[in-house]
Structures are given as structure tokens and as C-alpha cells.
Amino acid sequence: SRLRQEDFPPRIVEHPSDLIVSKGEPATLNCKAEGRPTPTIEWYKGGERVETDKDDPRSHRMLLPSGSLFFLRIVHGRRSKPDEGVYVCVARNYLGEAVSHNASLEVAILRDDFRQNPSDVMVAVGEPAVMECQPPRGHPEPTISWKKDGSPLDDKDERITIRGGKLMITYTRKSDAGKYVCVGTNMVGERESEVAELTVLER
């Protein structure tokens, strides 16, 4: 087939962007290319071609008409992590090929088990009280908040400081007594620790 004057090699006009997606959620890595004849698009992850519904109708990855890669759900296990990695799209026609920028797909996770649950604390009125927890492993790293008797703790109270996994009450009042729960949160959701009881004794 001879070269036609109006034909031109592929060029990527929309590059994929880095993504952080929760396990089980859908996701799209965008890619759009121009060229004449219209280029075919293939995706590669870590140098290996990515299988899509074009290869196996049961695949959870679909190659969209635009060239974008659509994940029906992000698959991510304790060991096998087939969707996580660095992707590129490659557009080809008989005049050549164009390769997109790298795009990393990271999977957001939040494990169930707290690395450290808070323990019961007993203090006298006016004394400081400290509770400590280490939330479940997660990506992105979970933020920590606390609940008292089922309601979010008022951290605007100047006596209360939350730093890392530590809850510090500089001087306790009788009203501080109750059931405390540590909460770890990221884009996946939230996890609550076991309950710890703060007992405040009269002097």
C-alpha cells in the first residue's frame, strides 16, 4: 500500500494521568491519539501488553473506542495485584507509533485490623489522660480521629490534642469519662477500633 499524501503518523493528544482508586471501584485511564489512517491503540503495563475484552470477553478491562482503558472494577488482592502498576498507551499505524507518558495506577486500601487498639484509662480529675491507637495499614495513609460515646470528639477544646495516634487531654473533667473509639479514615472508608473506657475519679 503506497503512502498517501494526507496520511500522517500517530500522535498522542490526550495522555493518561496518575490514578489512586479504591479496590472494587471502576476506573479509566484516558488515551486519545490522532493519525491517518486512524491508529490502533494498545496498552502496556510494566512492559507487558495488557489484556482487554478484545482478547477475552470475560476480562474486567475494556478498550474503549476512544482508546481509553476502562476497568469495570479494580482487582487487588492480598498477593495478586494485577491492576496496580505503571501504564502507557501505544498508538500505531503503518507510518509509525507514538507512546504516551507513563501513568501510575495505585490502589487505595484500608485494612480491617488496628495495629494497636486503645486501652482503658483511669485518672483522677485534673490529671492528664492519654489514649493511643495505631490504625490499620492503608494507602493513602489513614487519618485519625476519635469518637466519644458514639459522637465525634470536640477537638476544638483547647485541653484536647490529637497527634498521630495519640489522644491527649491535658487536665480531665468528670464529663470526659466515657467510651472512646479511634477512627482511621481514607478514601476507601473508615474503620473503628475497639472501645476504650476513660474513667475519671473524684479526688
Partner: antibody, heavy 118, light 105 residues
């Protein structure tokens, strides 16, 4: 089509070694852990260990440590299981199995019968 | 190691029966439990993953339940092709239960 195709049956003498291969096709080989499971005649399923095809990392239960070796060749998308110092009670069907992202063995090889007999 | 105990080791049932197989873990495994079916001379086949999720292509008469240490596989109405051996597996340490053979009464 996603499939695992294993090498053929083997007959070995006690003390020898056996190497079973498992050719993967239809999916990204390095994205999924590969496991080996065996089944002695009339018995249940026994997990032997895994290999991460991406980097070659392996893990085996205590029972098989020092006697089993798992390797892979990513260029031909094939995993291997080598069992040494064979005994008669190693007579079994050996399966390779892919671990899905749902933490289950969703694709299995057809099995390789290994007979250890003097 | 987490030990998986399956019961019963065998059972006899008729076509149309409701069949229940149980699996107990020696310590909590959350929902990390899978169920497989195996027929003589064949490789096992995944039925249920994550305790209760039905694998694609598996008939809806199969269902799984439980979390922590106690799990159940239920076949709501036994069909002739369901006579086989069933195995549970925990996907933390990957060990299998001893199996339950479902035979024709």
C-alpha cells in the same frame, strides 16, 4: 482464553528430583501469583507454596521448605516446580493454580501425575 | 498455621435436597475463605470466594456465608452434576480443609 497447561506425567525413583512446568497464556503473567497444590491418590488438596512471577519471590509451608524450588521464566510465561529427594509418599497429582485479585485460585492447570516408585 | 476443619467428611443426599457443608477455622480469618468443587480426575473449580461471593459462571444454587471462624457452603437444590468433593480454603495462609464428599443416596 486464560489457561494453564502443565507438562506430562513423570515416573521417578526414590531420591530423585522432578521438575513440573506450567505454561500460562491469555493474561498478564506477572500480575498474578502462581501456586502449586498437590493431591495424593484418594486424598485431599495440599498447598505447596507460591511464586510471584513479577520478582521471583517464593513462600512455602514448613513441610516443603528445603525440598521444593519454584522458579519462572517470564519470557515464555512459564512457572516451574522442582521437588527433590522424592519419596513414595510424594506420589500425587501436582497442580499449578493462578491466584486471582480476589485471593482465590480461579484458574487451574490440568494436573501432572508424578509417580515415585523403585 | 491456621487449621481448617470441614464437616461432615462425607454425606449422602438425593437430587433436589438442600445440602449444607461447614468449615471451621482454628482462628479468625475474617472473610478470607473460598470454596472449590472437584470431580474425579479433574482439577478443582472455584465456586465461592471471600466467603460469600459467587464466582462468575457458577449456578446461583451455590451460596456461601459466614465470617470469623465459622463458614457454610449451601447447595439449595442438589443437581446430578453436583455430586463431587467440596473443599474450603482460607486465603490468609492458603491451607485447605479436608474435603466433603457428596454422594448419591
Amino acid at each position: 482464553e486464560v489457561q494453564l497447561v502443565q507438562s506430562g506425567a513423570e515416573v521417578k525413583k526414590p531420591g530423585a528430583s522432578v521438575k513440573v512446568s506450567c505454561k500460562a497464556s491469555g493474561y498478564t503473567f506477572t500480575g498474578y501469583y502462581m501456586h502449586w497444590v498437590r493431591q495424593a491418590p484418594g486424598q485431599g488438596l495440599e498447598w505447596m507454596g507460591w511464586i510471584n512471577p513479577k520478582n521471583g519471590d517464593t513462600e512455602f509451608p514448613q513441610k516443603f521448605q528445603g525440598r521444593v524450588t519454584m522458579t519462572r521464566d517470564t519470557s515464555i510465561t512459564t512457572a516451574y516446580m522442582d521437588l527433590s529427594r522424592l519419596r513414595s509418599d510424594d506420589t500425587a497429582v501436582y497442580y499449578c493454580a493462578r491466584e486471582s485479585g480476589d485471593d482465590a485460585f480461579d484458574i487451574w492447570g490440568q494436573g501432572t501425575m508424578v509417580t515415585v516408585s523403585s | 498455621d491456621i487449621v481448617m476443619t470441614q464437616s461432615p467428611s462425607s454425606l449422602s443426599a438425593s437430587v433436589g435436597d438442600r445440602v449444607t457443608i461447614t468449615c471451621r477455622a482454628s482462628q479468625s480469618i475474617s472473610s478470607y475463605l473460598n470454596w472449590y468443587q472437584q470431580k474425579p480426575g479433574k482439577a478443582p473449580k472455584l465456586l465461592i470466594y471471600a466467603a460469600s461471593s459467587l464466582q462468575s459462571g457458577v449456578p446461583s444454587r451455590f451460596s456461601g456465608s459466614g465470617s470469623g471462624t465459622d463458614f457454610t457452603l449451601t447447595i439449595s437444590s442438589l443437581q446430578p452434576e453436583d455430586f463431587a468433593t467440596y473443599y474450603c480454603q482460607q486465603s490468609v495462609g492458603l491451607f485447605f480443609g479436608g474435603g466433603t464428599k457428596v454422594e448419591i443416596k
